[in-house]
């Protein structure tokens, strides 16, 4: 996959770049995974709608000690305005699924690649 | 067309609490968030904090942390924001506004606006 | 948090004339993924806000394209071209990069 420079390049890039560039960390993440993904740590699943970036950063920043998505939740938080912590819910319902890292990765991934595809959102 | 339609005003006494209403209309409920925002009179406008429907994730200006709760219902495409604990300072007009985001990032701006509920808090 | 500026405070204006808007900010408003989120809002007397234009220069659907915002980073500016008289009220900045997300104090457009 090519790397386009995103994050470490000097300026500002385009949102369409910056998502394509969150799309493909995540393909690097799914091909390249030998063992099980962050020791097949569990996280909250997410629903994937308006706000699926908090959202997922949410999820993702509980997982410690996992060096494979760490690119990954820096990532994130550049799609996300808010400030997010680990321990973190801002959902005031309660969570009741949860799915191994590889699994929510996956299902980001396509989710992201749809809606990369369509060029909409709402 | 995008409504929002909002409850109507308040009288209440200090230290007492009050949930207003913000009905959507003319859109998918869930793929928009909801921001409230306040307005004193004769001032600006002041960012409460917004809901995404579709998750009932809420994020506030730590202004108004502990002061409002923001909920939704998706059956009646409903969100509400309940103040606590009310003083004079409370006193204002406060708006719903759909919350729009693109596919790129959860970044946005308000659209479209409810016509206020004015909230008065007097003894 | 960020904060917003706006000059004038109050425009008095001729109907058909240009007038010109000044918003300012605290900090740079340009998010590293390129977008810059300013906004602009015209509240009418006993209305609600409604919504002018967005990132910086985008005129939001049905808004009359003698508006036009333009500017970067920390100054931006909002341009009527021929000021009609349903263009009266408050005009407000706003920005949406940073949070809490912030709004400017407004300026008054009204006929001289």
């Known amino acids: 996959l090519t790397c386009l420079g995103g994050f470490a390049s000097p300026g500002p890039v385009p949102p369409s770049t910056a998502l394509r560039e969150l799309i493909e960390e995540l393909v690097n993440i799914t091909q390249n995974q030998k063992a099980p993904l962050c020791n097949g740590s569990m996280v909250w699943s997410i629903n994937l709608t308006a706000g699926m970036y908090c959202a997922a950063l949410e999820s993702l920043i509980n997982v410690s000690g996992c060096s494979a998505i760490e690119k990954t939740q820096r990532m994130l938080s550049g799609f996300c305005p808010h400030k997010v912590s680990a321990g973190q819910f801002s959902s005031l319902h309660v969570r009741d699924t949860k799915i191994e890292v590889a699994q929510f990765v996956k299902d980001l991934l396509l989710h992201l690649k749809k809606l990369f595809r369509e060029g909409q959102f709402n | 067309q995008v409504q929002l339609q909002q409850s109507g005003a308040e009288l209440a006494r200090p230290g007492t609490s009050v949930k207003l209403s913000c009905k959507a209309s003319g859109y998918t409920f869930t793929t928009y968030g909801i921001s409230w925002v306040k307005q004193r009179t004769g001032q600006g406008l002041e960012w409460i904090g917004e809901?995404?429907?579709?998750?009932?994730?809420?994020y506030y200006n730590e202004k108004f942390r502990g002061k409002a709760t923001l909920t939704a219902d998706k059956s009646s495409s409903t969100a509400y924001m309940q103040l606590s604990s009310l003083t004079s300072e409370d006193s204002a007009v406060y708006f719903c506004?759909?919350?729009?985001?693109?596919?790129?990032?959860?970044?946005?701006?308000?659209?479209?606006w409810g016509q206020g509920t004015t909230l008065t808090v007097s003894s | 948090d960020v904060v917003m500026t706006q000059t004038p405070l109050s425009l008095p204006v001729s109907l058909g004339d240009q007038a010109s808007i000044s918003c300012r900010s605290s900090q740079s408003l340009v998010h590293s993924h390129g977008n810059t989120y300013l906004h602009w809002y015209l509240q009418k007397p006993g209305q609600s806000p409604k919504l002018l234009i967005y990132?910086?220069?985008n005129r939001f659907s049905g808004v009359p394209d003698r508006f036009s915002g333009s500017g970067s980073g920390t100054d931006f500016t909002l341009k009527i071209s021929r000021v009609e008289a349903e263009d009266l009220g408050v005009y407000f900045c706003?920005?949406?990069?940073?949070?809490?997300?912030?709004f400017g104090g407004g300026t008054k457009l009204e006929i001289k």
């Open positions: 809901i995404y429907p579709g998750s009932y994730n809420t």
């Open positions: 706003s920005q949406s990069t940073h949070v809490p997300y912030t």
């Open positions: 990132t910086v220069s």
């Open positions: 506004s759909r919350w729009r985001t693109s596919y790129f990032s959860d970044y946005g701006y308000f659209d479209y």
